[in-house]
């Protein structure tokens, strides 16, 4: 397991919510991405491929998410001070093999200015 701080801007604030950006390498074809708050799984997204290269996207812990070819964004809304914590992107790479897990994260600071325009 590889651990580290995200070397990119992980938190993007907008309208009283936050987009948490979890990046993965372009070469990765099949994976599971989990968003952890402290040690708790908040969200997950799993991408797998079928025999004809069809794609399946599944979530056991569903959050509003957005998938691109090198990132998964998880969206948290209605921010309040209780959201302040360490957040981690827990990436399990299935394909290409061998199986590998990487953990990157950062601390989400909540400031009054980010609470002003909450989405309902």
């Amino acid at each position: 397991e590889i651990n580290g701080s995200a070397n990119y801007e992980m938190f993007i604030f907008h309208n009283g919510g936050v987009q948490i950006l979890c990046k993965y390498p372009d070469i990765v074809q099949q994976f599971k991405m989990q968003l952890l708050k402290g040690g708790q799984i908040l969200c997950d997204l799993t991408k797998t491929k079928g025999s004809g290269n069809t794609v399946s996207i599944k979530s056991l812990k569903f959050c509003h998410s957005q998938l691109s070819n090198n990132s998964v964004s998880f969206f948290l809304y209605n921010l309040d001070h209780s959201h302040a914590n360490y957040y981690f992107c827990n990436l399990s790479i299935f394909d290409p093999p061998p199986f590998k897990v990487t953990l990157t994260g950062g601390y989400l600071h909540i400031y009054e200015s980010q609470l002003c325009c909450q989405l309902k």
């Epitope: 599971k32 797998t48 491929k49 025999s51």
Partner: antibody
């Protein structure tokens, strides 16, 4: 212990039909893509068909040589996979293997011992 | 469909020899290539997947390499139990096997 056991092979006349069965045990069958691979006597291996898992809506794919004549299906509750073969030709004579593959999270590949199909008048 | 070619079709070798089998795909298969060993009357056995990763329990004398369209399989020192037929298989899109290589004692 992982086991794949094929059955249903035998002698059939050209243009006839046959259904092969394969029963799986010892692994989580519903997570695996199930393939049929055949081998004519003294020849090499030839992929025939695959049926994907429920996550992929049980999608099926066939080699050009059998498309329109063969149908693969599965029953996850029984751990069974089937190959319905219609309009059989002499060149379909082969040992038919049932195989199970998975790539997530690790790559595994299991094979049965095969069942012989002979197409002859 | 992706086509696979394999060479040589027959490979006489002596015990202890280093032997190499080549496989070529009709298009780039992005390392989605496996190698199988088959002994007479038996089902094939997976040796290598994703070009160079050894399947569980496979001895380290077996290895694989390659990229794009071109791949190879090597036995560093041939043992008597290695005699049989070897097949490459692409799994980039569905499955296709190479025609096979029969490895025999010289």
């Amino acid at each position: 212990e992982v086991q794949l056991v094929e059955s249903g092979g035998g002698l059939v006349k050209p243009a006839g039909s046959l259904t092969l069965s394969c029963v799986a045990s010892g692994f989580t069958f519903s997570d695996y893509f199930m393939h049929w691979v055949r081998q004519a006597p003294g020849k090499g291996l030839e992929w025939v068909a695959v049926i994907d898992t429920k996550s992929f809506n049980y999608a099926t794919y066939y080699s050009d040589l059998v498309k329109g004549r063969f149908t693969v299906s599965r029953d996850d509750s029984q751990g069974m996979v089937y190959l319905q073969m219609n309009n059989l030709r002499k060149e379909d004579t082969a040992t038919y293997y049932c195989t199970a593959t998975i790539a997530v999270p690790y790559y595994f590949d299991y094979w049965g011992q095969g069942t012989m199909v002979t197409v002859s008048s | 469909d992706i086509q696979m070619t394999q060479s040589p079709s027959s490979l006489p070798a002596s015990l202890g020899d280093r032997v190499t089998i080549n496989c070529q795909a009709s298009q780039d298969i992005s390392n989605y290539l496996s190698w199988y060993q088959q002994k007479p009357g038996k089902a094939p056995k997976l040796l290598i997947y994703y070009t160079n990763l050894l399947a569980d329990g496979v001895p380290s004398r077996f290895s694989g390499s390659g990229s794009g369209r071109d791949y190879s399989f090597t036995i560093s020192s041939l043992e008597s139990e290695d005699i049989g037929s070897y097949y490459c298989q692409q799994y980039y899109n569905y499955r296709t096997f190479g025609p096979g290589t029969k490895l025999e004692i010289k």
